[in-house]
């Protein structure tokens, strides 16, 4: 019987250009973990598996960091990096677990780019 | 269900080299990392070195970097350590490891024994 929960960081928001930590949490069950697959949409960005460590897919490397523990690190974001992402928890004897995390990457803020306008 | 069968083991002189084969079955996603692990005599378990079966990549122990290479070849489900300038301190039995699917956990060979020694 499953009995654990995946708690993730939810919805979020990051501005593009910049970086992002995508992090689960795996609680309530004694089961091992034994790898966690990081996916965006059907892509899979990485691997950590408990014996063999982080393996980042080739498309993502130059741009996915792995860590802190089992999160990982979106970086120089964009926005076609918006969108949804799974945490896939593995473990034995229960199986699968699955978090979702949404996340928009937003163009940088006016108040930060835009014209500055001095009233006189 | 993954079963793994290793070959290539055997004795060799300090500073020869030998190439070790793992040949999977029933191996799932293909990105699914892959490696080898060795026990000596009287000794834990050590990770040597891993691949993801895209072979885009690669992990490897300090002890082992820049003497041995691990690859692998997806069409044949067959994963490569190639080891060079081998040591007597790299005697042991390596076994190969990969994560089963199957039962969600990772899966091990029943290992190649490696003597190095003159």
């Known amino acids: 019987m499953m009995t654990g929960t995946i708690e993730t960081t939810g919805n979020i928001s990051a501005e593009k250009g910049g970086s992002i930590i995508l992090q689960c949490h795996l609680s309530s069950t004694t089961a091992q973990v034994t790898q966690v697959n990081w996916e965006q949409q059907d892509q899979l960005l990485a691997i950590c598996n408990a014996d063999l460590g982080w393996h980042i897919s080739p498309s993502f490397k130059d741009r996915v960091a792995p860590g802190p523990g089992l999160g990982l690190t979106l970086q120089s974001l964009t926005v076609n990096d918006t969108g949804e992402y799974f945490c896939i928890y593995h473990t034995y004897p229960d199986g699968t677990y699955t978090g979702r995390i949404f996340l928009e990457v937003l163009e940088s803020s006016v108040a930060e780019h835009g014209a500055r306008f001095q009233i006189p | 269900e993954v079963q793994l069968v290793e070959s290539g083991g055997g004795l060799v002189q300090p500073g020869g080299s030998l190439r070790l084969s793992c040949a999977a079955s029933?191996?799932?996603?293909?990105?699914?990392?892959m490696g080898w692990f060795r026990q000596a005599p009287g000794k834990e378990r050590e990770f040597v070195a891993a691949?993801?079966?895209?072979?885009?990549?690669?992990n490897y122990a300090d002890s082992v970097k820049g003497r041995f290479t691990i690859s692998a070849d997806n069409s044949k489900n067959t994963a490569y350590l190639q080891m060079n300038s081998l040591k007597p301190e790299d005697t042991a039995v390596y076994y190969c490891?990969?994560?089963?699917?199957?039962?969600?956990?990772?899966?091990w060979g029943q290992g190649t024994l490696v003597t190095v020694s003159s």
């Open positions: 490891v990969t994560y089963s699917a199957y039962d969600f956990r990772n899966a």
């Open positions: 029933g191996t799932a996603a293909s990105f699914n990392p």
């Open positions: 691949i993801s079966w895209s072979g885009g990549s690669t």
